[in-house]
């Protein structure tokens, strides 16, 4: 019968007696940087080419006994998970292996760098189809390793890496912390985060998604037909590398940004029990388990968006946090969040010719996060319109006045320390969907975009009594681009998007009391692109 | 033993090819930074990745590496260039004493230097 992990990533449409999806990644080459491998194992023979690249440190310990099957164990298993004939994800994908880990599974940052350079040079000498690079390894945070990954990604290579097995914030490790890399955490058959002894899968904002990583059956280097079960974020990353190979084989022109957005879009949502993660990491960790798309084509009509969290600003009075989108993505909205509720909002600003989302800490605050909503919107022309504090009782407003521009997000930023305690702010009048409204002492920023066929609408959900969380979701066929709280009162901790739902968090009910101050409204801006829909219909 | 001779030969050549009066200060306004792994047991002191500024050509990378060797030799230190990077990042991998970091950070074209560290199968 089909192993649990392959069943989990397979949409119901494909589920038969066995896992045999169409076109198993045959147009894609997957590079594996790992241990040596047993490439003549029946699972992978003819599928994996062992390159002559080897850069490994000597094994530790004078009594270390180099046993070939142990040296090959990790890499052989992962090659099997990616492309194995019986237990592989992308059975048609061809692989190339580079040895950067020794028989104890240990390597160096420098050896990995030289390996990545080798791949880039190979790509230049003999350009092939789409390339996926699997990095099932982790070390401490490394500026140079992250930089090399960034360069390779910008050369059109898809890099997939293990989040790490340290039950820790993945941002403290490399290459997991590199924004250009697809970073994968591990879940088990119950869709729970994987525990590995006293440790387990890493988590946090640097993780893009999770994938099966416990009790994964794959090729064993003990014999040429043996199988073994292994666990770890390497196994999870191998699943995503396989899924990426399948997607790229179906659509070879996909960019890294498009691939990442699709991986997120087609993942199973909200199935992981977040209680396993430390409390402060839950909101930052994506609740996504990777899956193959239900059909290889026809996803192009969708407007894809994802949420990108910044690093924590730190607690100083003037501290700020910045969230950035990938080069091919548009920043359609910007919000902020602070656990203490002490923040001074957020604004979209230009940096190096690109919009970024900056959140501002407030005096006495423990720090803030900036939250960017990053979307794929071809031929988009976006700008930010700002209205300074109005000082009038009706509050501050700003709208998209340019012809053909629609509102995709609202941000507000204020200089005063305790916004909203002076006078209860008013709700904005109905029937004006193309404008942002905020507190009279705040400056308001509207993200206004023009793109072929783009249409947006505002959806609100208000709760009169205080509540820790207010949500509003976009309906089927619409994508959440903007998420904010109306009207931005002091007890609002912030707003952020989780998949297609806008979440507004407030201070604990017990501390706020049930005054008119308690009224909270979550405002979602939902968009769709008729242009993308038409384009995909024409293709079909 | 052979290795050491090789190093010595390389150093002598480097010394002969370098002029004594070369500027040791980096370009104005920018200070190169040093980075190392926050996890102490994973550090690999003695091996460093010297990363050069983005538009540095291979020939400049090689020249900077030779200059480091020559200046180190003048101070009585043996160094070994293990690899010259090009294609992804400009720079080089050098085996040297940590005492030379201050010197290396002042070399022209240097963006930052990172001490090598371990990575592990996950």
């Amino acid at each position: 019968s089909i192993p649990w992990n392959l069943e989990r990533i397979t949409p119901p449409r494909y589920r038969a007696d066995e896992y045999q999806p169409p076109d198993g990644g045959s147009l894609v080459e997957v590079y594996l940087l790992d241990t040596s491998i047993q490439s003549d194992h029946r699972e992978i023979e003819g599928r994996v080419m062992v390159t002559d690249f080897e850069n490994v440190p000597e094994e530790d310990g004078t009594r270390f006994h180099r046993q070939a099957s142990k040296c090959d164990s990790h890499g052989t298993h992962l090659a099997g998970v990616v492309s194995g004939r019986d237990a592989g994800v992308a059975k048609g994908a061809s692989m190339r292996s580079l040895r950067v880990l020794n028989c104890q599974g240990k390597g160096t940052v420098s050896g990995t760098l030289i390996g990545l350079e080798f791949i880039r040079k190979s790509q230049l000498v003999q350009p092939v189809g789409p390339l996926v690079v699997l990095l099932p390894l982790a070390g401490g945070y490394s500026r140079v390793l992250n930089a090399a990954c960034q360069r390779l990604a910008r050369a059109g290579v898809v890099l997939v890496t293990a989040a790490g097995n340290f039950r820790d914030d993945a941002c403290l490790y490399s290459p997991a912390s590199a924004p250009e890399v697809i970073t994968v955490g591990a879940t088990n058959a119950q869709d729970q985060p994987v525990t590995l002894g006293t440790l387990g899968t890493n988590f946090g904002r640097c993780v893009d998604l999770f994938a099966p990583g416990e009790d994964i059956i794959g090729a064993s280097s003990d014999c040429s037909t043996c199988f073994v079960s292994q666990s770890g974020t390497s196994q999870a990353a191998a699943h995503v590398a396989g899924i990426a190979a399948m997607m790229l084989s179906a659509e070879p022109e996909l960019t890294l940004a498009e691939l990442r957005q699709r991986l997120i879009h087609f993942s199973a949502k909200d199935v992981i029990n977040e209680a396993w993660f430390p409390e402060d990491q839950r909101v930052l960790t994506p609740n996504l388990v990777a899956a193959l798309p239900p059909s290889t084509h026809g996803a192009g009509w969708q407007l894809f968006c994802r949420t990108v969290w910044s690093a924590h600003s730190g607690p100083t009075r003037m501290a700020t946090a910045v969230a950035r989108c990938a080069p091919d993505e548009e920043l359609l909205s910007c919000s902020s969040f602070s656990r203490s509720g002490k923040r001074r909002g957020e604004r979209m600003e230009a940096q190096g010719g690109k919009l970024v989302c900056r959140a501002h800490n407030a005096f006495g605050g423990e720090g803030v996060y900036a939250i960017a909503r990053c979307c794929l919107l071809p031929q988009a022309n976006c700008s930010v319109h700002t209205a300074p504090p109005a000082e009038a009782s009706m509050g501050t407003r700003v709208h998209c006045h340019q012809q053909g521009h629609v509102l995709t997000g609202c941000s507000s930023h204020w200089e005063v320390e305790d916004l909203g305690t002076h006078k209860p702010p008013v709700l904005r009048p109905r029937g004006q969907p193309n404008q942002c409204v905020g507190h009279r002492e705040a400056s308001i920023h509207a993200s206004c975009c023009h793109a072929p066929g783009l249409e947006c609408k505002v959806k609100e959900h208000g709760i009169p009594a205080p509540q820790e969380q207010v949500t509003v979701a976009c309906e089927e066929g619409w994508t959440l681009t903007g998420c904010s709280a109306l009207p931005g009162t002091s007890h609002v901790l912030g707003a952020y998007a989780v998949d297609n739902t806008c979440v507004v968090r407030s201070r604990d009910v017990s501390t706020t009391g049930s005054t008119s101050e308690g009224a909270v409204t979550a405002v979602a801006i939902c968009c769709r692109s008729r242009h993308l829909a038409q384009a995909s219909q024409e293709l079909q | 033993q052979e290795d050491e001779d090789g190093d010595y030969e390389e150093l002598v050549l480097a010394l002969r090819s370098e002029e004594d009066g070369l500027a040791e200060a980096p370009e104005h306004g920018t200070t190169a930074t040093f980075h190392r792994c926050a996890k102490d047991p994973w550090r690999l002191p003695g091996t460093y990745v010297v990363v050069l500024k983005e538009e540095t050509h291979l020939s400049q990378s090689e020249r900077t590496a030779r200059r480091l060797q020559a200046q180190a030799a003048r101070r009585g230190y043996l160094t070994k260039i293990l690899h010259v990077f090009h294609g992804l990042l400009p720079g080089f991998l050098v085996k040297m004493s940590g005492d030379l970091l201050e010197l290396a950070l002042k070399l022209p074209h240097v963006d930052y230097i990172e001490e090598d560290s371990s990575v592990f199968a996950q």
């Epitope: 047993q38 490439s39 023979e45 | -």
Partner: antibody
């Protein structure tokens, strides 16, 4: 191009041993093992086992256990199949083929066991 | 071991004919079935692997289908060079096992 070249025909007496060689070329040896298949006169094909160029590991058919040995010499890119205690029913054409997939075959070596 | 049964054991056909050979496995082998062609005095040649995939260089008149236990090799238009013996082989389990062969003769 990818090819497997086998040693010449052998005539052996019952009880003797035979060692057939198979020289591989045109591909990366470590990526595939070598399968051995035999075909008795007028009969079908029978898989005998597999041997690795990479680490010398073997996988024998049960019928062969104890009587046959498969080895490789990566330095000469050659695989060997030795069969001991030959019987008349071992008379067959012995083929080597690339890997478990058996996508490339040697030309065959005829082994005749006769008193 | 998995038993493979081919039918017919021999058949006579003319050039241009459409020829179908079937192979049945004693248990499910998913799609792990290969077809070989063997001419007298020659080594077998791989025609189809994984039930339906043709290696490069094999003419398109050869096609394979089936999954589970029942498989078919079809020659859409028999050519003079196609007169040979055809073997199916399961690749699901070790040991790989072959069918007894189907001899395609000139009518």
């Amino acid at each position: 191009q990818v090819q497997l070249v086998q040693s010449g025909a052998e005539v052996k007496k019952p009880g003797a041993s035979v060692k057939v060689s198979c020289k591989a070329s045109g591909y990366t040896l470590n990526n595939y093992g070598i399968s051995w298949v035999r075909q008795a006169p007028g009969q079908g094909l029978e898989w005998m086992g597999w041997v690795s160029f990479y680490n010398g590991n073997t996988n024998y058919a049960q019928k062969l256990q104890g009587r046959g040995t498969m080895t490789t010499d990566p330095s000469t890119s050659t695989a060997y199949m030795e069969l001991r205690s030959l019987r008349s029913d071992d008379t067959a054409v012995y083929y080597c083929a690339r890997g478990y997939v058996m996508d490339i075959w040697g030309q065959g070596t005829t082994v005749t066991v006769s008193s | 071991d998995i038993q493979m049964t081919q039918s017919p054991s021999s058949l006579s056909a003319s050039v241009g004919d459409r020829v179908t050979i079937t192979c049945r496995a004693s248990q499910s082998i998913n799609n792990w079935l290969d077809w070989y062609q063997q001419k007298p005095g020659k080594a077998p040649k791989l025609l189809i692997y994984a039930a339906s995939t043709r290696p490069s260089g094999v003419p398109s008149r050869f096609s394979g289908s089936g999954s589970g236990t029942d498989f078919t090799l079809t020659i859409s238009s028999l050519q003079p060079e196609d007169f040979a013996t055809y073997y199916c082989q399961q690749d699901q389990d070790i040991p790989p096992t072959f069918g007894q062969g189907t001899k395609v003769e000139i009518k």
